[in-house]
């Protein structure tokens, strides 16, 4: 009888020990299984979870625009006054709704190439007005012409055309014209076959971005989604030195198992450069734990503050000998047009940049760019890309519309907020397939370990107690 009880207690302790050991073993084995599954599923090839979402994003992406409406155009043109602007928006478009095209796997170098078609659909219900709303903005062609043709003879010729077309420093244009293109009356007088259509994003609809060639991760998962080449080249040919490199991914995803200490590098064709984001905070996105990576102010600093940025300063006059910060001259990437990119409202820009403009209110929360990355898969589940498009306008003695200017201006035209958030359904699916399974496995591991240890200890105590009783 005593033996039965003792045997039972020992059996219980053994079972507990087995459960605890099994739970303990399950930890590294489970992690290995998870890693293996993740590695298999994030590879960019037919049949994987990643590939399905990669070809056509399951996230609805919106691009909101705020236009800087100039309140005192005549005063600026006549007296070189400060430009008073008032932002109007949002005007919202749905973007990135088209699937990637010309997808070609290269099994030799483990890459996949594709183009990303561009398209934009106006969303009236998410906008403050219609595409026909009018704005007073800088005359893009008039501002760009003397910058492209710094030759005084040609400037006299262009002045004749500007006068004939009754163009001036500022113009009134509808949202649709400003964003997607309009026939410019001044350029239409040039007696050569040149493009006479002007627009901040012209041409956009029915165009493609790429060709991108990215690593599919089949041979090395730590390279998945990293861009191997863009438009057939490993460099951009826009910047000197290492600034010209195409680094990282396209920001839609990153190699899995993202650590907080990691710097996420990505390339954005919108800003014609590679950039980076650093860990900001941990947040909960629809029940999914994600890491919020933010673009640091350092990325927009002058070479004085951040020597790594020296090769992004390609022009010495406007940048005050590379001491100004917060604006990026992307003219080389825009056929020589004087286009400058910044954060909205000149956030993180030097005072000399924003000084000639009145009506700007930079705000970290509203105007910064961030990426919410799920650390296990490396998928970007939410993002907000914010940037501002500015045009440089300089005094030009030979062009009457610009001859009264006493200083150059980096004129804000518009700023945009491109956002995407994983949908509720997709989030649930993600939780079920990824975080849910990992949580469940963790719980099973802990339960087995916990129950096993408790059983082992309890049965051993009982056994010892029993033995000592019998001994007495």
């Amino acid at each position: 009888m005593g033996c039965d009880r003792n045997c039972g207690l020992i059996a219980g302790a053994v079972i507990g020990a087995v459960l605890a050991v099994f739970g303990g073993i399950l930890m590294p084995v489970g992690d290995m299984l998870i890693e293996k599954t993740i590695k298999r599923e994030v590879v960019l090839e037919e049949g994987t979870t990643a590939f399905k979402n990669w070809v056509k994003t399951g996230t609805t992406v919106y691009r909101q625009f705020w236009i800087f409406d100039v309140q005192n155009p005549d005063d600026v043109a006549k007296n070189s006054s400060k430009i008073k602007v008032k932002q109007r928006g949002p005007y919202t478009y749905r973007v990135r709704y088209l699937a990637k095209e010309n997808i070609t796997q290269d099994p030799e170098d483990h890459t996949v190439s594709f183009v990303q078609p561009n398209g934009a659909i106006f969303e009236p219900s998410l906008s403050v007005g219609t595409e026909d709303d009018n704005f007073t903005v800088l005359n893009l062609a008039v501002a760009a012409a003397p910058h492209i043709y710094q030759n005084s003879f040609v400037q006299v010729v262009l002045n004749s055309l500007i006068k004939k077309s009754k163009s001036s420093m500022f113009q009134t244009r509808s949202l649709k014209e400003l964003l997607w293109g309009y026939k410019d009356p001044f350029l239409s007088l040039v007696p050569y076959p040149i493009s006479t259509t002007v627009g901040v994003f012209y041409p956009y609809n029915d165009t493609v971005d790429g060709v991108y060639k990215v690593f599919n991760g089949k041979d090395n998962i730590s390279k998945v989604a990293i861009i191997e080449s863009y438009k057939g080249k490993r460099n951009l040919s826009y910047w000197p030195s290492y600034c010209d490199m195409i680094n990282g991914t396209d920001a839609a995803s990153f190699p899995p198992f993202v650590e907080k200490s990691r710097t996420l590098r990505f390339f954005s064709s919108d800003i014609c450069r590679s950039i980076y984001a650093v860990f900001g905070s941990e947040i909960d996105l629809k029940g999914i734990p994600v890491y919020r990576f933010v673009l640091p102010a350092n990325a927009f600093a002058s070479p004085l503050q951040n020597p790594d940025n020296h090769c992004f300063c390609t022009e010495k006059v406007i940048s005050n000998n590379c001491t100004s910060y917060g604006v990026l001259d992307i003219g080389k990437c825009k056929e020589g047009k004087p286009v400058y990119i910044s954060l909205p409202h000149f956030l993180h820009a030097s005072p000399d940049v924003s000084e000639p403009i009145e009506g700007l209110h930079p705000n970290e929360d509203e105007h910064r760019t961030y990426l919410d990355v799920e650390p296990i898969t490396g998928f970007t589940l939410q993002f907000a890309k914010r940037l501002q498009v500015n045009i440089l306008v300089k005094p030009a003695r030979k062009i009457e519309a610009l001859k009264n200017l006493k200083r150059p201006y980096i004129v804000p035209i518009l700023w945009l907020n491109e956002t995407g958030t994983i949908g509720d359904e997709k989030a649930e699916m993600f939780k079920t397939q990824v975080t849910g399974k990992i949580k469940l496995l963790g719980m099973v591991e802990m339960a087995l370990l916990g129950i096993g240890v408790v059983m082992f200890v309890a049965f051993m105590i009982s056994y010892c107690a029993c033995k000592s009783k019998n001994g007495k």
Epitope: Q150, N151, F153, V157, K164, L189, P191
Partner: antibody, heavy 117, light 107 residues
Amino acid sequence: EVQLVESGGGLVQPGGSLRLSCAASGFTISSFGIHWVRQAPGKGLEWVAWIAPYGGYTYYADSVKGRFTISADTSKNTAYLQMNSLRAEDTAVYYCARSFFGYFDYWGQGTLVTVSS
Amino acid sequence: DIQMTQSPSSLSASVGDRVTITCRASQDVSNWVAWYQQKPGKAPKLLISYATSLYSGVPSRFSGSGSGTDFTLTISSLQPEDFATYYCQQHSNAPLTFGQGTKVEIK
């Protein structure tokens, strides 16, 4: 086909006047602007005068300023060079030429102006 | 005014020779330089604009190079029809100015 034809040259006494014409076909002179370039016998090319597109601007070489006037009649698609107070050193073949960006892609055949007593 | 100085003022060469004519501007004209060919009794003909851009219909044996103040016209293999006078011209600033010309003669 683009063509420029000069006329109006001839012999004139010092101090006299002459009006050269440049009839254009195959393009609109107002869109491009027209230049007059001259070449003295056995010498190089000398730029003389220019009327910018749409008549928005006229420009003259220092050697002819105040004596020569360039003009255009868009209805006739013809440019003119009115030459007053002519001097012996104005003797040359006068060419009209088309230009937009400052280089001359089409030239007339030239008309000879001789200033002599 | 911008002075354009051409050299040499004349040269003798044979058919098939490589010929180089240089032109120096008195100040920076970027790439705003054109080259012309003129035969006796005829109007000049445009060969090159923007220092390097070959005008349509001009044989590829003609080429231009240079930027800033120093420019070159090269004829890679001289042909019988190339014996003429060549002029450079800056189209950067008014007044537009020409070089004094280089006469290419048969050796």
